[in-house]
Amino acid sequence: MMCLECASAAAGGAEEEEADAERRRRRRGAQRGAGGSGCCGARGAGGAGVSAAGDEVQTLSGSVRRAPTGPPGTPGTPGCAATAKGPGAQQPKPASLGRGRGAAAAILSLGNVLNYLDRYTVAGVLLDIQQHFGVKDRGAGLLQSVFICSFMVAAPIFGYLGDRFNRKVILSCGIFFWSAVTFSSSFIPQQYFWLLVLSRGLVGIGEASYSTIAPTIIGDLFTKNTRTLMLSVFYFAIPLGSGLGYITGSSVKQAAGDWAWALRVSPVLGMITGTLILILVPATKRGHADQLGDQLKARTSWLRDMKALIRNRSYVFSSLATSAVSFATGALGMWIPLYLHRAQVVQKTAETCNSPPCGAKDSLIFGAITCFTGFLGVVTGAGATRWCRLKTQRADPLVCAVGMLGSAIFICLIFVAAKSSIVGAYICIFVGETLLFSNWAITADILMYVVIPTRRATAVALQSFTSHLLGDAGSPYLIGFISDLIRQSTKDSPLWEFLSLGYALMLCPFVVVLGGMFFLATALFFVSDRARAEQQVNQLAMPPASVKV
């Protein structure tokens, strides 16, 4: 229940005090260069989240202004910028926009809850699905692999589309699509397991559209601390949706007496949410990029975006670190409940399990811990980072690194504690997961800082692809393979069932340490990459001829 698709969403943070004065000077200079002191009405209310649709550009570090480039025939509107005085002052917005943006963020977060609710409803009734279709463990693995692989492949495609086309339409279509597929999958006859596999693949495609694009809309609707707050709410949706998915799965199944009904809840809610997104989410413009009009889009190809991202060392290292988190969460999520059950068998506090659900109680406890630590981790990480930003410009990657290295210690301690105390093991899981999840929102901040707005959806998608490919796409199977390998060379006993899985899971803390190292590497390049991104954003504020991305 610990997926990280959204970990790389756009997120802005509180800027460092020492740089504020310089930014204000730059902003005022840009405003003068843009030429006007008078103010006229905004050209349209369409660009929610950017001040007046054509002029003030919310960058990573403040706002800049440029001369508006209206379509031919539009009367020139020189200086349609804010005349507001003082740092950070924003232009007047249409009256409804404030409330509208809040509603939009709430709807997008609700959509994210449903994304994860849908995914984990299937996890909640997986045993029933296995029982009904006669699915072997390798078949259950296939269901997960197909979902992750289709998600992985679709994410970069939606990243490309999300940087170039109407995002709320793509979002709504994505939700309608996975809702229809999930609903249909509840009617698949027993003999058509391959149709269930296909449906999971299609759901992965639908959900990829959401996880890739929704955070970038929130990133464009809000700035600075408000954006951080809204993205935190968006992230809380992950553990909340995951937990609700398990609960929905089991409770609806019990109430209806048939697991198929569990798969009909999220699609109904999905259809409603998709409609609300179409109605309530404004057609946001992409940060500053909208102000630059079409000439920017004409000059930046997908290939160029990819090259720029691959050359961006902070982005590359933070993506590798995210992969390490994904590796650990994927493996732990799948194997820890069974590991703890086996620990109890060894301690003679539980019976050897011959028929499912094995470790159902442990799954439930682990699920509850994951939900809470997901929430706590985001809060802790965001709070720690805001405090550390007062001390250093490298706060974001350093807090992530400390979280990762601390997490590795507690993940190691799980295997020490499990031999004698299940409660001790749960405490270690709690602390370890909280530290591991503390980088969810921060990784998003890092991406936001070092990637220019017109590449954010692509960046989110590529990071999502990488974290799955190197992370949870293979880790559960690798752990299972190592465990089986160890068991083959030992005698068949409950003790060795427990020990072999424990030894295999010891790979996780090593990968987490590696992730911590990647965050430390990110810290080395973070300041320079961030400065380069800001410089590009400021270049974009100049006349079109000088724009170079």
Partner: antibody, heavy 125, light 107 residues
């Protein structure tokens, strides 16, 4: 050619135990789910127990009427499936069939595509 | 548990006639029904799987239909070797259950 051969039947007293064995050949036993189905004299068919393959953790399922008394097990190295019957009752008198479930690698059918010739178990005092 | 009811319990026909055997489930089971034939003093054999899917080696005169709760096994032009007992089985949920059987006898 798929072959299922049951052995171990006979006449026993109520309360005693008996172990049925089913030797298989002609297919990949380790990947296949196996079941025992019984038929009381002059009556219909009744499913008794199912054992899944190692890829499904050799999970066992039982009919309510025999739960706690009968145990199904398998030995992949010998391609054999067993039914350990304890605390036998008069109503356990039946012909016991060893059956195979059709396998599709990722999943298995719950129906029986091959049946053994059956072995008679008589519980009587 | 899902209960299967077969009707009629006994069916008397003359060779060459076509017959339909019925199986009704106590709840909706989609197409998770299978048909077996058991000749006298022999083991059962699978005739039809998943309500209508044919099995290799089974004569084409055997066919199945139905979905939900009502299922039919049809035998087109009954032959002498077809006189036996026919059972339906559900695999929608555990425990696996069989119908009581329909005996097809010579008129």
């Amino acid at each position: 050619e798929v072959q299922l051969v049951e052995t171990g039947g006979g006449l026993v007293r109520p309360g005693s135990s008996l172990k049925l064995s089913c030797a298989t050949s002609g297919f990949t036993f380790s990947d296949t789910w196996m079941s025992w189905v019984r038929q009381a004299p002059g009556k219909g068919l009744e499913w008794v127990a199912l054992i899944k393959d190692k890829n499904s953790n050799s999970e066992a399922n039982y009919a309510e009427s025999i739960k706690g008394r009968f145990t199904i097990s398998r030995d992949d190295s010998k391609s054999r499936v067993y039914l350990q019957m304890n605390t036998l009752r008069d109503q356990d008198t039946a012909t016991y069939y060893c059956t195979r479930h059709e396998d599709f690698y990722y999943y298995s059918g719950y129906y029986f595509d091959y049946w053994g010739q059956g072995v008679m178990v008589t519980v009587s005092s | 548990d899902i209960v299967l009811t077969q009707s009629p319990p006994t069916l008397s026909v003359t060779p060459g006639e076509s017959v339909s055997l019925s199986c009704r489930a106590s709840q909706g089971i989609s197409t998770s029904i299978h048909w077996y034939q058991q000749r006298s003093n022999e083991s059962p054999r699978l005739l039809i799987k998943y309500a209508s899917q044919s099995i290799a080696g089974i004569p084409s005169r055997f066919s199945g239909s139905g979905s939900g709760t009502d299922f039919i096994l049809s035998i087109n032009r009954v032959e002498s070797e077809d006189f036996s007992v026919y059972y339906c089985q559900q695999t929608y949920s555990l425990p696996l259950t069989f119908g009581p059987g329909t005996k097809l006898e010579v008129k």
